[in-house]
Amino acid sequence: ELSPQPSNEVNLLDSKTIQGELGWISYPSHGWEEISGVDEHYTPIRTYQVCNVMDHSQNNWLRTNWVPRNSAQKIYVELKFTLRDCNSIPLVLGTCKETFNLYYMESDDHGVKFREHQFTKIDTIAADESFTQMDLGDRILKLNTEIREVGPVNKKGFYLAFQDVGACVALVSVRVYFKKCPFTVKNLAMFPDTVPMDSQSLVEVRGSCVNNSKEEDPPRMYCSTEGEWLVPIGKCTCNAGYEERGFICQACRPGFYKASDGAAKCAKCPPHSSTQEDGSMNCRCENNYFRAEKDPPSMACARPPSAPRNVISNINETSVILDWSWPLDTGGRKDITFNIICKKCGWNVRQCEPCSPNVRFLPRQLGLTNTTVTVTDLLAHTNYTFEIDAVNGVSELSSPPRQYAAVSITTNQAAPSPVMTIKKDRTSRNSISLSWQEPEHPNGIILDYEVKYYQKQEQETSYTILRARGTNVTISSLKPDTTYVFQIRARTAAGYGTNSRKFEFETSPDSFSISGENSHV
């Protein structure tokens, strides 16, 4: 299987990729020779071989062309070679070797003549056990791979040289490379290609945020001598309207949005809203749908509620209890409240005016959360129209018409207010004379008063009622020395007022008479 070259290696020379002859210098000419061969994947390549194993004193040199250093400080030489076992060649015991030598020479000039003594030895290369088995026919050749480091290199370029001292060897490929920390994106920050130092120190590199992102913490990484990025610090996050996709910040697609900077993903537009363009930070409400000022962008767009339904009025003289049902359509919000608009109208319903400020609403007139209100202190025998508005958080953003239900009523005449005090004028063994004042609010002409009484000890199980035209009465046929309880209420054309509170008076014992005594409860 082909193993791709690591992305952190930059080739300065790769003999496999050179088309045609390599054209390296062989000295002497009958030593290393350029031939056609195959690599470990049976790909045809140009290769150099030498197999002068008969002679004791071999000194065959092969020099590459000049290799530019580029920005490398430390270079790596990867040799793939096949070394023929000396035992497989009869007659050559003693003269055959199984090693060769690797040299280099730095130079600013690429026209340098070959001189052995100018080269510095890198290492003696021997076949080890880390080979790839290559089946050529049924013979297994050992394809060895050896890597050597050279550095620091300072001049503009260098030559490599291979010295054969009597081996049967083929250089299948020569690759010279340096290591870099390759361009990478980490935490949405871009780090450029960086060539490490030759020394053991790490190079600190500042990252730059990818498009459509911003720094959360300043992004940094360290480039090691081995061309590896280490210790990512800090990060960038995608702007509003963009989300992280792989190594980029990608615009939210139409129909999606992202309201704020950060790591969140683009979200689908909430109900009744949409976006037509890429990179939306929020979604626009559809026609006739709205979002309140303080609503988050994630909230669905809503519309005002429909009108309340089934309004029922329950009139009690100059009070009315209004009840209604929840709107059929809430508009998509839960913050529905009701406002009561009160209008006092003439006998022509079109001639209305706002109600007097004296009119009272229980629990209140505006911002009702329940579907009932009691309106009091209305005028008797008056036409009123009540408009019940249903509103929610977006009602004020929509154009009229208002969504309300209306009910018109006419108040009755009000009954009189209670009699406040009852006074005992005279007592006898069988009678009590009482007087009282007219109610503070007669609300019309008092037709008569109803006087209700009973013996205290009988606890209202049996009582007597009598009517008085004026504001006094004498009750007779009572038992002597007995406590009676009295309550009085006034009557007008509108009906009875409420009863007074209870007053207690006693009849006199036998042959005893008292007058002018106030009540006690």
Partner: antibody
Framework: QVQLLQSGAEVKKPGASVKVPCKAS????????MSWVRQAPGQGLEWMGW????????TYAQGFTGRFVFSLDTSVSTAYLQISSLKAEDTAVYYC??????????????WGQGTLVTVSS | EIVLTQSPATLSVSPGERATLSCRAS??????PAWYQQKPGQAPRLLIY???TRATGIPDRFSASGSGTDFTLTISRVEPEDFAVYYC????????FGQGTKVEIK
């Protein structure tokens, strides 16, 4: 250029000996082994063996031991094949051929023109 | 000793045709054989050796392939000068030749 020069035809009686020379030129004689190949009239090629021109160490193929000897004179870059006790069946063209050793396999890349040895009474 | 058997003994082809020569080993051999061409009255000439490498001056219409026990020499388009006898040769501790295949004009 590289070449191997052999002597002309030899006619020998049975039981006699013959020494066939092979003179190399155009390359370092001691850097390449020399092989000997026999071809009887109308027949195929037979490998007889080879000699290490550096050490003089010979190797003989099966059937070519005893009466056949490979030798050298490196001073004149010449290899020799000596056959003793000649027999009629030794009648053949004898070729010297330079050995081509490579990592990937061997062959004989330069051949002499051949020496016809005829054994006849 | 490994025996190399070449087939066919004679191959008749017309110029411009493809010629395929076979060489079979009696047992699995250590590498691809070398191939030689011999014309009447001439010494053999090395065609291909090692890893199917053509010898110096050999045209690229000659190619070799195979592994194990079965090997092939192919002449992609036979030229008039290619009519000759072809030998395969196996090497190792002991070298052996096949008996040869004669390529003649059809």
């Amino acid at each position: 250029q590289v070449q191997l020069l052999q002597s002309g035809a030899e006619v020998k009686k049975p039981g006699a000996s013959v020494k066939v020379p092979c003179k190399a030129s155009g390359y370092t004689f001691t850097s390449r082994a020399m092989s000997w190949v026999r071809q009887a009239p109308g027949q195929g090629l037979e490998w007889m063996g080879w000699i290490n021109t550096n050490t003089g160490n010979p190797t003989y193929a099966q059937g070519f031991t005893g009466r056949f000897v490979f030798s050298l004179d490196t001073s004149v870059s010449t290899a020799y094949l000596q056959i003793s006790s000649l027999k009629a069946e030794d009648t053949a063209v004898y070729y010297c051929a330079r050995v081509r050793l490579t990592v990937y396999g061997d062959g004989m890349d330069v051949w002499g023109q051949g020496t016809l040895v005829t054994v006849s009474s | 000793e490994i025996v190399l058997t070449q087939s066919p003994a004679t191959l008749s082809v017309s110029p411009g045709e493809r010629a395929t020569l076979s060489c079979r080993a009696s047992q699995s051999v250590s590498s691809n054989p070398a191939w030689y061409q011999q014309k009447p009255g001439q010494a053999p000439r090395l065609l291909i050796y090692g890893l199917s490498t053509r010898a110096t001056g050999i045209p690229d219409r000659f190619s070799a392939s195979g592994s194990g026990t079965d090997f092939t020499l192919t002449i992609s388009r036979v030229e008039p000068e290619d009519f000759a006898v072809y030998y395969c040769q196996q090497y190792g501790p002991s070298w052996t030749f096949g008996q040869g295949t004669k390529v003649e004009i059809k």
